[in-house]
């Protein structure tokens, strides 16, 4: 498949045209625009797909004012100015107005919760499988196998800092070099990036609102595997980070400090606990080989228990099983030695819902994976209609203009690295670059701010989840101090690494760019943001790692084509853009690939067909269960759920109206509302209504 | 109280074999090993083997391998060591001595057998 | 078999001395060593197990120290019915092996 599908035989700016005139759908754009709007969008589209990549003929097709999908959208405020209110009028205001923010910190609140819970069930789910990949004895020659352990394993735990303490300790009981550990601090780096995305699906609802949430979403995954792409080469080859990390290591006097401090757990875990507990010390017993752990449950039962430890003798069939000759003795008949043996009293059980069920932790853990992604889905929905409702005219003027306006001239370079300290700074709070990036994803939805800011505050918020895990490490017993302060420093670097090679310079910005044609084309197909995070965070891991197993020849054998061809797509891409009189007539475009390698159309029927069968039912679902059937199924008429598809069906072969254009409405009220059926100041309400 | 009764002296001609016993009263007699040692006139102590009567299980001491024999009859919590192809220089006092749990030093011991052999 | 080396084989001494006997062991028993004292015409009695511990109902002047191959047995003031033979134990492997014995005798 060509790597801007579609994109090819049009036009050389894939932020604007992809898929197509795909980009010329407007976000949110203003009612009278929308009312306006006719299918003759569509007429373009084919214009643009059969001109060459490199023609100059799209110009003419053009508008003369282009609508940009990245563009912010205007929320217009349809409420009565407060000058214009009386006092009671004002006063019922004022108390509408504290009651969303109780309402947006109450949801905010239970979103943040809801992450915590996702975590643990993953771990649930998948942790003891995680534990697993890090007893695998190549991972200290092979640090592609170790990147994808860390992708995998973060991605199965939901947590970097589950996986890095996993890491750490291996590397403090010499299981783990530091040289094999840094290449999965990187792939932790990448796994950690998921939870962001899996939160993007949910505003799959609305095309706009996906777009730019999806994009993002997925700046923060671009900047870690393009990261991880220079930077993993230039550490197997110069190992510069272990270097730098060494030497920071060896010049301080490090003391003990304390542990990080724990600010917005504070808060969470009290309901959190009241949940689930788990014993994460299990997953780091698997890594490291413990065959007791592997039937231990991660459930915690037991929160208070007594460890006593004391010396017993016991009987061993020679004096050389003794634990030394010093200890070692007879009783005339049997040889005697004598062992450490800790004994744990249960004091008190744990006080959550599954202390009591002693089910096995795949139940517990999908039970809780439905329940937290349904809170998450619930809360998210719920965010974005409050916000959505606040956010208006005035006060959204001011905040956008806040957070996305530059400094003044000469300055306004500056204001990326203070958005990256903010970013950092925040991330530092909330103890979670996941909790910071997620949470700033439905912002990006719904327009407040935008990709280019957000790019800086993400990149921010991976150098805040370094310094937490620095603070962690500096404040770990004496004999993981080390190890682990090299380990979070690595993370730093790498980061800060990173952010040298893919921030300062606009042009390199390439992020940026990849996430939003990523946007563009989950936006057209939905289905391909699922698709998306199935590739990049399960099956190209689970890949490499599987032909890491077969061996480095293998894996030699397999890379080396796959990656010649990516390179040679690339240049080819390239050259078709930039200079395409070189290129033979043939490949001035890729017309010569049959379609279901350049275009996504041909997917796109097939996954159609596929999810069909709950096209007809899916808007019946629930409203909070409709959004997850319509990223599968694809339908822009999902998001209305009060009625069943029958109807819908009908109001839209009364219409005529395409179902996967992009051009056209992105649910079935907005599209009877540009007839006059609707009252426009419902249709925003009715689309995202739980 | 614990309390370890033996047999009587015995007088034995070269050759011949000897069964001591040791009738033992106040304690749990399976939990404990049996001892037997022995001390010539005037001569230091010399172990002979142990018995375990909750097994039957023994441990000898190579210099009396082949010659000795422990058993224990726990209906009787009473232990017996016997000692065949007597020679003169077998001639001495044998006590049983009960093993205190886990280790090989020996708290209560019985008042002695004195074997005399002689032709 | 380990042997054990008990001196001095025969000790004069007066009501009140401090005694002291040591027990040199052919190779490393640990702490596993027992100390017995033996009246004429009497069973052993245990005194001393794990070369420090006292066994119950022995009087706190009886001690015993050491580890290793060197062990030493103390009276910190003797008493009349203390001159009897004292013997050496090693549990540490079989055979379990005695000291030849030291003889406290009356000054």
């Known amino acids: 498949m060509a790597p801007w599908p579609e994109l090819g035989d049009a036009q050389p700016n894939p932020d604007k045209y992809l898929e197509g005139a795909a980009g010329q759908q407007p976000t949110a754009p203003d009612k009278s625009k929308e009312t306006n709007k006719t299918d003759n969008t569509e007429a373009p589209v084919t214009k643009i797909e059969l001109l060459p990549s490199y023609s100059t003929a799209t110009l003419i097709d053009e508008p003369t004012e282009v609508d940009d999908p990245w563009n912010l959208p205007t929320l217009q405020d349809s409420g009565i100015k407060w000058s214009e209110r009386d006092t009671k009028g004002k006063i019922l205001c004022f108390f509408q107005g504290i009651g969303r923010l109780i309402l947006l910190l109450g949801f905010l609140y239970f979103f943040v919760c809801s992450l915590d819970i996702l975590s643990s069930a993953f771990q649930l789910v998948g942790g003891k499988m995680a534990g697993q990949f890090f007893s695998n004895s190549s991972i200290m020659s092979n640090p592609l196998l170790g990147l994808v352990i860390g992708v995998l394993v973060t991605v199965l735990v939901q947590s970097s800092s589950t996986s890095t303490s996993i890491v750490v300790s291996m590397v403090s009981s010499s299981l783990l070099t530091v040289r094999a550990a840094i290449p999965i601090i990187m792939g932790a780096n990448i796994g950690t990036s998921i939870t962001n995305t899996i939160v993007a699906l949910m505003q799959v609802g609305d095309r706009s609102e996906f777009r730019r949430a999806f994009a993002g979403a997925t700046v923060h995954d671009f900047f870690n595997w393009l990261s991880v792409l220079v930077l993993l080469p230039v550490e197997v080859a110069t190992h510069y980070l272990e270097i730098i990390t060494q030497l920071i290591v060896e010049s301080f006097h490090f003391k003990n400090g304390e542990d990080a401090p724990d600010l917005l757990k504070v808060i969470t875990k009290p309901f959190t606990k009241l949940i689930v507990q788990l014993d994460k010390k299990v997953i780091s017993q698997i890594a490291m080989n413990d065959e007791k752990a592997k039937n231990k449950s991660l459930v915690k039962i037991w929160c208070k228990t007594f460890t006593n430890k004391t010396q017993i003798n016991v009987t061993v069939p020679s004096t050389a099983n003794c634990t030394s000759p010093s200890l070692c003795w007879t009783d005339g008949i049997q040889n005697w030695t004598m062992k450490n043996v800790t004994y744990k009293e249960n004091i008190a059980k744990c006080q959550h819902i599954f202390v009591n069920f002693h089910l096995p932790d795949l139940a517990v853990g999908t039970i809780l994976l439905i329940l937290s992604l349904l809170v998450l889905c619930g809360c998210l929905i719920m965010i974005v209609k409050i916000l959505g409702s606040v956010l208006k005219g005035q006060v959204a003027t001011v905040i956008k203009k806040t957070i996305n306006t530059d400094f003044p001239f000469p300055f306004a370079w500056l204001t990326g690295y203070l958005a990256i300290l903010v970013g950092a700074g925040m991330t530092f709070i909330v103890q979670s670059s996941s909790v910071f990036t997620s949470a700033l994803t439905p912002l990006i939805g719904i327009g407040v701010i935008t990709i280019e800011r957000a790019y800086p505050l993400t990149l921010g918020s991976n150098i805040g989840t370094t310094t937490t895990a620095i603070l962690a490490a500096l404040a770990s017993p004496g004999n993981a101090l080390r190890s682990s302060l090299q380990i979070a420093l690595c993370h730093f670097f790498f980061n800060i690494s990173g952010i040298l090679l893919w921030y300062p310079i606009p042009f390199t910005r390439l992020p940026i760019r990849m996430a939003k044609g990523l946007g563009n084309i989950s936006a057209k197909y939905r289905w391909f943001a699922v698709f998306y995070l199935i590739i990049f965070f399960f099956l190209i891991p689970l890949t490499v790692f599987g032909l890491s197993l077969a061996g480095w020849r293998v894996l030699v054998g397999v890379g080396v084509p796959v990656v010649f061809i990516i390179i040679l797509v690339l240049c080819l891409r390239l050259l078709q853009s930039r200079c395409p009189r070189v290129l033979p007539k043939k490949l001035q475009n890729w017309n010569f690939l049959p379609l279901w390698m350049r275009s996504l159309k041909p997917w796109d029927a097939v996954v159609s067909k596929f999810t069909g069968c709950f096209q007809m039912r899916c808007c019946c679902c629930c409203r909070v269960c409709c959004r997850a059937c319509c990223l599968l199924c694809d339908c822009p008429k999902c998001c209305r759920c009060s009625k069943c598809c029958e109807d819908l069906e009908e109001a839209q072969e009364g219409q005529d109206v395409p179902v996967k254009a992009p051009e056209t409405f992105d649910n079935i009220t907005i599209s009877r509302e540009a007839q006059g059926e609707v009252p426009a100041s419902d249709s925003k309400t009715e689309c995202t209504a739980l | 109280q614990v309390q370890l009764v033996q047999s009587g002296a015995e007088v034995k001609k070269p050759g011949a074999s000897v069964k001591v016993s040791c009738k033992t009263s106040g304690y749990t007699f399976t939990t404990n090993n049996m001892h037997w040692v022995r001390q010539a006139p005037g001569q230091g102590l010399e172990w002979i083997g142990a018995?375990?009567?909750?097994?039957?299980?023994?441990a000898y001491n190579q210099k009396f391998k082949g010659r000795v024999t422990m058993t224990a009859d726990t209906s009787t919590s009473t232990v017996y060591m016997e000692l065949s192809s007597l020679r003169s220089e077998d001639t001495a006092v044998y006590y049983c001595?009960?093993?205190?749990?886990?280790?090989?030093?020996?708290?209560?011991w019985g008042q002695g057998t004195l074997v005399t052999v002689s032709s | 078999d380990i042997q054990l080396t008990q001196s001095p084989s025969f000790l004069s001494a007066s009501v009140g001395d401090r005694v002291t006997i040591t027990c040199k062991a052919s190779?490393?028993?640990?702490?596993?060593v027992a100390w017995y004292q033996q009246k004429p015409g009497k069973s052993p009695k245990l005194l001393i197990y794990?070369?420090?511990t006292r066994h119950s109902g022995v009087p706190d002047r009886f001690s015993g120290s050491g580890s290793g191959t060197e062990f030493t047995f103390t009276i910190s003031s003797l008493q009349p019915e203390d001159f009897a033979t004292y013997f050496c134990?090693?549990?540490?492997?079989?055979?379990?092996?005695f000291g030849q014995g030291t003889k406290l005798e009356i000054k």
């Open positions: 001595a009960r093993g205190m749990y886990g280790h090989g030093a020996m708290d209560y």
């Open positions: 018995i375990y009567p909750g097994s039957g299980a023994t």
């Open positions: 134990q090693q549990y540490s492997s079989n055979p379990l092996t």
């Open positions: 794990w070369a420090t």
């Open positions: 190779q490393d028993v640990g702490t596993a």
